[in-house]
């Protein structure tokens, strides 16, 4: 049964469809294939830490290394990326944190994504001294494996050198890559010798070999691209938003929600409020009014702006944010003080995440 | 291993009630929707609506306001649908499906018949 | 009610070809729609989310673009195990809506 009752007609149902937003990422954790993770569960007073991993539960293996309030990944592969939570249970409540872990090299083979520094890769000789080819900057070739989420953009690059300058082709899996052999298609920028492909799909998995060949010789350098794919899930609050704040009578407050949803959010604002001077129903849930809702005629719903307030104002509210997947919540209290107080943004409370989990 | 078990078939008396269980395993039960959906030979796959096991919220079709009522259970983790005042229309397959319809439970055969 | 409508209820086609079955929303859905694959006696099978991403485990022959209105489910080369019913979703809005179905038959 729900867990409130409403007052004014109002619904927490989407009763229009949900505007689009620009979405807030959670706190991301980047390792490198191989490597060692170590991330603190960021919870106070946690009588009881409990893990999960895209939404099932985490228990410690032989890779897993759970103590107290922290998660140990040991040897880290592509497939430890995803959405993790930590859950601290209290005797009267419990909280949740949640952060990403993404297994993955840097977008570029060791090289920012615009190619601003590429010229200096393109070496030019002394006509007289001959030479077969040589790589010219072996650091951004280091890293061999690049695993990346589906949909993103990879660059691989063999900067070479040479006289007659080099040329430079790509092999996948062995055989020569052609266009048609992926949706899209590729990129060779020969003056920064990279291969790029926009939007990677889990077929673009494999073995990316560049040969670079004049007449007096050929190396070869060999990358292996691994594309890790997503499952949907539900909205992600940024922790500590809503912020806890406090203003004047008659001042004005603006709450703040930053939500991460591959899926299309519908936001709300909620406050507990009275009815009949009751705080709650008949059935002893607590009454709720939605005061703000993502829809057609809402502008920026992960923002409720207050203004004018009174002491009627003074109290929790909720940002409840829900997809098809699922939903979570966190609140903030208003204090409205007297006109002779001065306000202050309560940046020593912090709000207590109220996830519905 | 995600698993989403439906109870079996029912054959029931038009004018009557029934109650379909879902029971989830292998995931984080609070943490996800159960959607129901309806499928007929003639009109397809039909949203039912959806609860939200951690706190009770749920989301109809309107079309199945009157007609369905979902409820879950976090203790045994199962979600359950009850269908009331049957009909041969309400004769179809009924399906729950975790929040990202990624996992779908067998399916339940409702008959309504006389 | 956001409507979505599979054009063609049948498609015919061989194993090595590639098929494009489309779907049209109603109104603007964004890349809020999902494909689902059916065969007899089995539950819908997860394919593609939220217009383009490929569930996790389904092979990579299935892809899946649009945005908006307009949505194309491809298979880039069948195989006779990918006869069956085939459906667009669109999770943009309650009623979630599917399609009519699309079913994949050998010639």
């Known amino acids: 049964r729900p867990s409130f009752s409403l007052v004014e007609d109002t619904t927490l149902e989407p009763e229009e469809p949900p505007t689009k937003y620009q979405i807030s990422q959670p706190e991301v954790y980047v390792a490198a294939p191989g490597e060692s993770l170590e991330v603190r569960c960021l919870l106070k007073d946690a009588a009881v830490i409990s893990w999960t991993k895209d939404g099932v539960h985490l228990g410690p293996n032989n890779r897993t290394v759970l103590i107290g309030e922290y998660l140990q990944i040991k040897g880290a592969t592509p497939r430890d990326s995803g959405l993790y939570a930590c859950t601290a249970s209290r005797t009267v409540d419990s909280e949740t944190w949640y952060f990403m872990v993404n297994v993955t090299d840097a977008i570029s083979s060791g090289d920012d994504e615009d190619d601003t520094d590429g010229a200096e890769d393109f070496v030019s000789e002394n006509s007289n001294n001959k030479r077969a080819p040589y790589w010219t900057n072996t650091e951004k070739m280091e890293k061999r494996l690049h695993a990346v989420p589906a949909a993103n953009t990879v660059k691989f690059r063999c900067p070479a050198g040479g006289n007659p300058m080099p040329t430079m082709r790509w092999l996948k899996n062995g055989k020569e890559f052609k266009q048609e052999h992926r949706i899209g298609g590729y990129k060779v920028r020969n003056q920064h010798w990279s291969l790029i492909m926009e939007s990677v799909v889990p077929s673009d998995k494999g073995n990316y070999t560049c040969v670079v060949e004049n007449e007096y010789g050929s190396i070869n350098h060999t990358y292996h691209l691994d594309v890790v794919e997503r499952s949907p899930h539900r909205p992600i609050l940024q922790a500590g938003l809503p912020a806890n704040a406090s203003t004047v009578v008659g001042g004005d407050v603006e709450f703040v929600c930053k939500v991460y949803s591959d899926a299309q959010p519908h936001i709300q604002w909620i406050k507990h409020v009275e009815k009949n001077g009751s705080k709650y129903g008949p059935d002893g849930l607590p009454y709720l009014k939605v005061l703000k809702h993502s829809g057609i005629n809402s502008s920026n719903a992960e923002v409720l702006a207050l203004f004018n307030v009174t002491e009627a104002d003074a109290g929790e509210y909720i940002c409840k944010v829900s997809n098809y997947i699922g939903q979570a919540n966190q609140s903030a209290w208003l204090t409205v003080l007297p006109k002779q107080q001065a306000p202050g943004r309560e940046k020593e409370i912090t709000a207590s995440p109220d996830y519905l989990e | 291993e995600v698993q989403l078990q439906q109870s079996g078939a029912e054959l029931v008396k038009p004018g009557a009630s029934v109650k379909m269980s879902c029971k989830a395993s292998g995931y984080t039960f609070s943490f996800y929707n159960v959607h129901w959906v309806r499928q007929t030979p003639g009109q397809g796959l039909e949203w039912i609506g959806l609860i939200y096991p951690d706190n009770g919220d749920t989301s109809y079709n309107q079309k199945f306001k009157a007609k369905a009522t979902l409820t879950a259970d976090k203790s045994s983790s199962a979600a359950y649908m009850q269908l009331s005042s049957l009909t041969s229309e309400d004769s179809a397959v009924y399906y729950c499906a975790r929040g990202g319809f990624d996992y779908w439970g067998q399916g339940t055969s409702l008959t309504v018949s006389s | 009610d956001i409507v979505m409508t599979q054009s063609h209820k049948f498609m015919s086609t061989s194993v090595g070809d590639r098929v494009n079955i489309t779907c049209k929303a109603s109104q603007d859905v964004s890349t809020a729609v999902a494909w689902y694959q059916q065969k007899p006696g089995q539950s819908p099978k997860l394919l593609i989310y939220s217009a383009s991403y490929r569930y996790s485990g389904v092979p990579d022959r299935f892809t899946g673009s649009g945005s908006g209105t307009d949505f194309t489910f491809t298979i880039s080369s069948v195989q006779a195990e990918d006869l069956a019913v085939y459906y667009c979703?669109?999770?943009?809005?309650?009623?979630?809506?599917f399609g009519g179905g699309t079913k994949l038959e050998m010639k």
């Open positions: 979703q669109q999770h943009y809005s309650t009623p979630y809506t």
